[in-house]
C-alpha cells in the first residue's frame, strides 16, 4: 500500500506564438482545479481503461479575474498535493491523465459551470520511495509543470511497496528467512500478509491480500483439497470433506461484457473492465458525454448530448483511437522518397533528403552532373544522388584525373607480355597462343580454337585485338 503524490507547479500559456486567451474575465471570474487519473502499465490501451490505480481531485484554486488587455499569466493554483492512495503493490510502470478544469463563478442558474481547459497524458516508469520526478506537458497552447512521486505507507517498503517492515523484536538479528529492511537497519522484513483466512499450510501469497493455492488444494482460501475421484457419490447430504473439480462453461464464455469491455474470471463471478465512457457490471451503462471532454489531443467531440447516447471523437491529423489518444506513426507510411529520413515533429512531417535529392518528400532528383567536370575526356553519368565519371581509356579515378596502368591487372593470358599503348594495351603472345589477350591456343595442324574469324581475316593470321 502507498500513495501517489502529484504537485502542480504552474499552469499557463506555453512558449511560442499564439498565447491562449485567459480562461477568466471580469464578467466571468473563475478558478481552477485538477483531476488526476492513474492506470497501471504502459499499454497503448491505457486511455481506454478505467483509472484502475485510482483518481483524485484537487481543491479549488483562488478566484481569478483577468486584467483587461493583459496576456494570460500563470493562473493561481489550488493549495496542496493531489494524493492517490493505492492499496496493492505499486506497478512501477503507469499511465497518467491530468486534467485542468475551470469553474466559472458568474451568475449561472443552477450553480457554477465546469469546463475542461486542458488534458495531458503520458506513460512513465517510477519506483516507489524515489525522489520527486519533474515533468512538463503541453496541451495546445497551455503548459503544465508538475512533480510526482510514489511513496509506501508503513509498514510497506521497497520499490513496489510489497515488502513489509516491522521493528526488531530481538536487538541483534531478524527472524529466520527475514532480512533487515535497508535503509531502516533497525527494522526487519515482515512476512507478507495474505488474504484473511488463507490457509497457512496450503496457501501462499506474492502480494498482500492474495491467496494462491499449492498443488492439490483449491478454494478462495485454499482449504479445499482437490479430489481426483468423484465427490458427488451418494455419501449423505452436503458432505464437505473433499473438494472436487468438474468441467463446465467458462465464466467469460461468450463475453458477458458489453461495449467492448474485457472479461476476467474470478472465483465466484466475473469482472468486466469497461472502456472509457461505460460502466456497470457488464459495461452496459454509458456515462460520458461531450460535456466531459472525452477527446484527447484536440479531437472534436460529436454526440453524447443525453447520457444514453455515445460520443464520437473526430481526431486531428496524426492521432487515432476512440478518444484520439493514440499518436499515428506517420513515418511508418514511408512518405520520404529516394531514401530520405522521415521525422515526425508532431505538428508536421519533415523529410531529411540524401545528397542529390530535394523537395518536401525528397521527390526531386537534382542534376548531379551540373557544374561537375570529368577530366581527360571522361563523360559524367547521373544516378542515385551522386555523379559518376565514365573515363576514357588510360584514365581512372572519381574525376578521371588518374592515369591508369592498363597492364596492372595482368590481362595477357598464358605468359603473354603486356605493353601499354596510347589507345589501350597490346599483348605479345607466347608461342602457341593467339588472341587479343592470348586466350586461344593455336592447334598443331594450323587451325585455331577461334570459333569464327572476323571478316577479312583467316584463322592463324597475326592480329591485335584492342
Amino acid at each position: 500500500a502507498g500513495v501517489f503524490e502529484l504537485q502542480i507547479h504552474s499552469f499557463g500559456p506555453g512558449p511560442g506564438p499564439g498565447a491562449p486567451r485567459s480562461p477568466c474575465s471580469a464578467r466571468l471570474p473563475c478558478r481552477l482545479f485538477f483531476r488526476v487519473c492513474l492506470k497501471p502499465g504502459l499499454s497503448e490501451e491505457a486511455a481506454e481503461s478505467p483509472c484502475a490505480l485510482g483518481a483524485a481531485l484537487s481543491a479549488r484554486g483562488p478566484v481569478y479575474t483577468e486584467q483587461p488587455g493583459a496576456p494570460a499569466p500563470d493562473l493561481p493554483l489550488p493549495d496542496g498535493l493531489l494524493q492517490v492512495p493505492f492499496r496493492d503493490a505499486w506497478p512501477g510502470t503507469f499511465s497518467f491523465i491530468i486534467e485542468t478544469w475551470r469553474e466559472e463563478l458568474g451568475d449561472q442558474i443552477g450553480g457554477p459551470a465546469w469546463s475542461l481547459l486542458a488534458r495531458v497524458a503520458g506513460r512513465r516508469r517510477l519506483a516507489a520511495g524515489g525522489p520527486w520526478a519533474r515533468d512538463i506537458q503541453r496541451a495546445g497552447a497551455w503548459e503544465l509543470r508538475f512533480s510526482y512521486r510514489a511513496r509506501c505507507e508503513p509498514p510497506a517498503v521497497g520499490t513496489a511497496c510489497t515488502r513489509l517492515c516491522r521493528p526488531r523484536s530481538a536487538p541483534s538479528r531478524c527472524g529466520p528467512g527475514l532480512r533487515p529492511c535497508a535503509p531502516l537497519e533497525d527494522e526487519c522484513e515482515a512476512p507478507l500478509v495474505c488474504r484473511a483466512g488463507c490457509s497457512p499450510e496450503h496457501g501462499f501469497c506474492e502480494q498482500p491480500g492474495e491467496c494462491r493455492c499449492l498443488e492439490g488444494w483449491t478454494g478462495p482460501l485454499c482449504t479445499v483439497p482437490v479430489s481426483t475421484s468423484s465427490c458427488l457419490s451418494p455419501r449423505g447430504p452436503s458432505s464437505a470433506t473433499t473438494g472436487c473439480l468438474v468441467p463446465g462453461p467458462g465464466p467469460c464464455d461468450g463475453n458477458p461484457c458489453a461495449n467492448g469491455g474485457s472479461c476476467s474470471e474470478t472465483p465466484r463471478s466475473f469482472e468486466c473492465t469497461c472502456p472509457r465512457g461505460f460502466y456497470g457490471l457488464r459495461c452496459e451503462v454509458s456515462g460520458v458525454t461531450c460535456a466531459d471532454g472525452p477527446c484527447f489531443n484536440g479531437g472534436l467531440c460529436v454526440g453524447g448530448a443525453d447520457p444514453d447516447s455515445a460520443y464520437i471523437c473526430h481526431c486531428p491529423p496524426g492521432f487515432q483511437g476512440s478518444n484520439c489518444e493514440k499518436r499515428v506513426d506517420r513515418c511508418s507510411l514511408q512518405p520520404c522518397r529516394n531514401g530520405g529520413l522521415c521525422l515526425d515533429l508532431g505538428h508536421a512531417l519533415r523529410c531529411r533528403c540524401r545528397a542529390g535529392f530535394a523537395g518536401p518528400r525528397c521527390e526531386h532528383d537534382l542534376d548531379d552532373c551540373a557544374g561537375r567536370a570529368c577530366a581527360n575526356g571522361g563523360t559524367c553519368v547521373e544516378g542515385g544522388g551522386a555523379h559518376r565519371c565514365s573515363c576514357a581509356l588510360g584514365f581512372g579515378g572519381r574525376d578521371c584525373r588518374e592515369r591508369a596502368d592498363p597492364c596492372a591487372a595482368r590481362p595477357c593470358a598464358h605468359g603473354g607480355r603486356c605493353y601499354a599503348h596510347f589507345s589501350g594495351l597490346v599483348c605479345a603472345c607466347a608461342p602457341g597462343y593467339m588472341g587479343a589477350r592470348c586466350e586461344f591456343p593455336v592447334h598443331p595442324d594450323g587451325a585455331s580454337a577461334l570459333p569464327a574469324a572476323p571478316p577479312g581475316l583467316r584463322p592463324g593470321d597475326p592480329q591485335r585485338y584492342l
Epitope: G219, V226, S239, G243, P251
Partner: nanobody, 126 residues
C-alpha cells in the same frame, strides 16, 4: 452447518419438462455461486448450469443451452433448474452444488465444488 437439499426429480417422457429445487441452509446463497452438476450413467460429472445470485448472471453448458434455465430466489435461499425439451441423454443424477471457478486446464474450464447435496434422479424415457 452447511446443507443443500435437492427435490423435483422423477420420470418424464422425451420432450417433457421438470423443475428441480435446491434449498440451502447454513450459508447465504447471495454470497456464493450455485451450480447444478449432473452425472449420467457411465459418464463423468458435468456442471450444466451456474448462477451468481448477486447479479443474476448465468452460464450454461452447450449441451443444455436454450433448454435449461437456472434461477435463484435469495429471499428463500433457494436455487432452481427449469428443464424443458428433455432428451434421453439428459438422464442423470442432478446435484445442487456450491461452486467457484478454479481455472482452465487441458481445454476445459474447471469448477471446484466444496458442498453438494445428495442428488435427485432425473430419468427421461418413453
Amino acid at each position: 452447518e452447511v446443507q443443500l437439499v435437492e427435490s423435483g426429480g422423477g420420470l418424464v417422457q422425451p420432450g417433457g419438462s421438470l423443475r428441480l429445487s435446491c434449498a440451502a441452509s447454513g450459508f447465504n446463497i447471495s454470497e456464493h455461486s450455485i451450480g447444478w452438476v449432473r452425472r449420467a450413467p457411465g459418464k463423468g460429472e458435468e456442471l450444466v448450469a451456474r448462477i451468481y445470485p448477486t447479479n443474476g448472471y448465468t452460464r450454461y453448458a452447450d449441451s443444455v443451452k436454450g433448454r435449461f434455465t437456472i434461477s435463484a430466489d435469495t429471499s428463500k435461499n433457494t436455487a432452481y433448474l427449469q428443464m424443458n425439451s428433455l432428451r434421453a441423454e439428459d438422464t442423470a443424477v442432478y446435484y445442487c452444488a456450491r461452486s467457484y471457478y478454479h481455472g482452465y486446464s487441458h481445454g476445459h474450464h474447471y469448477y471446484a465444488i466444496d458442498y453438494s447435496g445428495q442428488g435427485t434422479l432425473v430419468t427421461v424415457s418413453s
